[in-house]
């Protein structure tokens, strides 16, 4: 951004900039951010025995250290490495569920199918889900007024870099058959510019990942079209196949029914195929 250029070119200290310069286009840090992160960490480690060894104060210190006192348009993946190290967690093979533009359904699904995991079911994703945060250069303050917007201000902001970092790691550690939920109601069912399309797809490891199974989620109730034939799905298939990973696509024609049948497979409406 222009501000970034000024900062770099003139090498001026952040606190020397006039106050109006600190106004970003995005909403500010979520209120009670430190308390929320700490509380989520405690709750998560209580519910997940395999993460009971995690010291939540250390997690918060590492999280804070990634963005506090740093120019919020100059955050790097390196800044988050101490946090990533503390939050190291593995998903069993065949149990990774990625998603793109359909977060709510993906989360509803993993709440029912408890042995599958989205990034937000892991500690670091759980801590940050739906939160915004940023700091200010050379102060220990958290900026509750505004934070950089990915489009209008800069892409290397604390929130975007966090999700890029943990998404990359989540994809890198996936193994077996990896699943992804895609939104069949969007004009681009597969979007190369989404986190899935730009980060996760390219960080699946062919030596560990046997296949990517895409679930295209239909929006219309009576929509029986084969959305697996969509040009963007063919594009995804091409990208994945070139990476020596097998690709398979499934239509989820009625997501409500699918969820219901995963939850209650003995339900009479789930007992006969047509």
């Amino acid at each position: 951004s222009g501000l970034n250029d000024i900062f770099e070119a003139q090498k001026i200290e952040w606190h020397e900039l006039p106050r109006w310069r600190q106004q970003w286009s995005g909403s500010g840090t979520t209120s009670r951010f430190p308390e929320t992160v700490l509380a989520r960490c405690v709750k998560y480690t209580e519910v997940h025995p395999e993460m009971r060894h995690v010291d939540c104060q250390s997690v918060w210190d590492a999280f804070k250290g990634a963005f506090i006192s740093k120019y919020p348009c100059n955050i790097t993946e390196e800044d988050y490495q101490p946090l990533v190290k503390l939050g190291t967690q593995t998903v069993p093979c065949n149990k990774t569920l990625l998603w793109s533009r359909i977060k709510d359904l993906a989360h509803q699904f993993t709440q029912v199918q408890r042995d599958m995991f989205t990034l937000e079911d892991m500690l670091l994703g759980y801590l940050a889900d739906d939160l915004t945060w940023c700091g200010e250069f050379n102060t220990f303050e958290i900026n509750y007024q505004s934070c950089p917007d990915w489009r209008k201000d800069c892409s290397n902001n604390p929130v975007s870099v966090f999700w890029k970092t943990v998404s990359r790691r989540f994809a890198e550690t996936a193994c077996g058959v990896v699943h992804v939920m895609l939104n069949g109601s969007r004009s681009k069912i597969f979007d190369k510019n989404s986190t899935f399309g730009s980060v996760e797809v390219h960080n699946l490891q062919p030596e560990k990942v046997q296949a990517l199974e895409a679930w295209v989620i239909h929006g219309g109730r009576e929509d029986s079209r084969d959305l697996c034939q969509d040009p963007t799905i063919k594009e995804l298939e091409s990208i994945i196949s070139k990476r020596n990973i097998r690709f398979f696509c499934k239509n989820i024609y009625r997501p409500d029914k699918f969820l219901q049948c995963v939850k209650n497979p003995e339900d009479s409406s789930c007992l006969s195929g047509i």
């Epitope: 046997q210 097998r246 409500d256 497979p265 789930c270 195929g273 047509i274």
Partner: antibody, heavy 121, light 110 residues
Amino acid sequence: QSVEESGGRLVTPGTPLTLTCTVSGIDLNSYAMGWVRQAPGKGLKYIGIMTSGGNIYYANWAKGRFTISKTSTTVDLRITSPTTEDTATYFCAREREFYGGGTSGSRLDLWGQGTLVTVSS
Amino acid sequence: AYDMTQTPASVEAAVGGTVTIKCQASQSIYNFLNWYQQKPGQPPKLLIYYASTLAFGVPSRFKGSGSGTEYTLTISGVESADAATYYCQQGWNSGILDNSFGGGTEVVVK
């Protein structure tokens, strides 16, 4: 509607062999066709499948060893370089998609009688 | 993968008795489980699909049940004609074919 395999015979190791699955009353643009084999006294083993849209999926173990192709009424299975381990009865079967639980799956609902391939020197 | 494990490999049953065959998938196949019957010298014949739906013409003594990763084929009132080998197969993902059939269960009728 019927499915019939042909082309099975005695071949020497390394001699390519093509098996043909001929369908009658089945539109190959509407149905997928799978090849399954069964070694003497052993279980069923999926080799690969040709989808109605022309996609071909192979089992990992079968990649490079077999090639599937189709015409309007046949689906061929080429054994590129047979070994004695490829001695088996080869079945062709129609895969039928069906709906259930808000999504779909498949079943092999129509099978041929099979054709026997013996690989021996 | 979707690896199918079938047990037992062989089972004996008296005429009129009951046989139970189990099939376990390495991950959920959401009820898309098929059962086939194969008699010596014949191709497999579809018995049950979608875990519990009987294929056309299959007698009601054959019953399929289960969900998620665990499935069962039960033959009640076994007849001598039921002597055969039975296979389960996952029908959820036909793009991943390795081990998509179970190893088979031979049913011997005494």
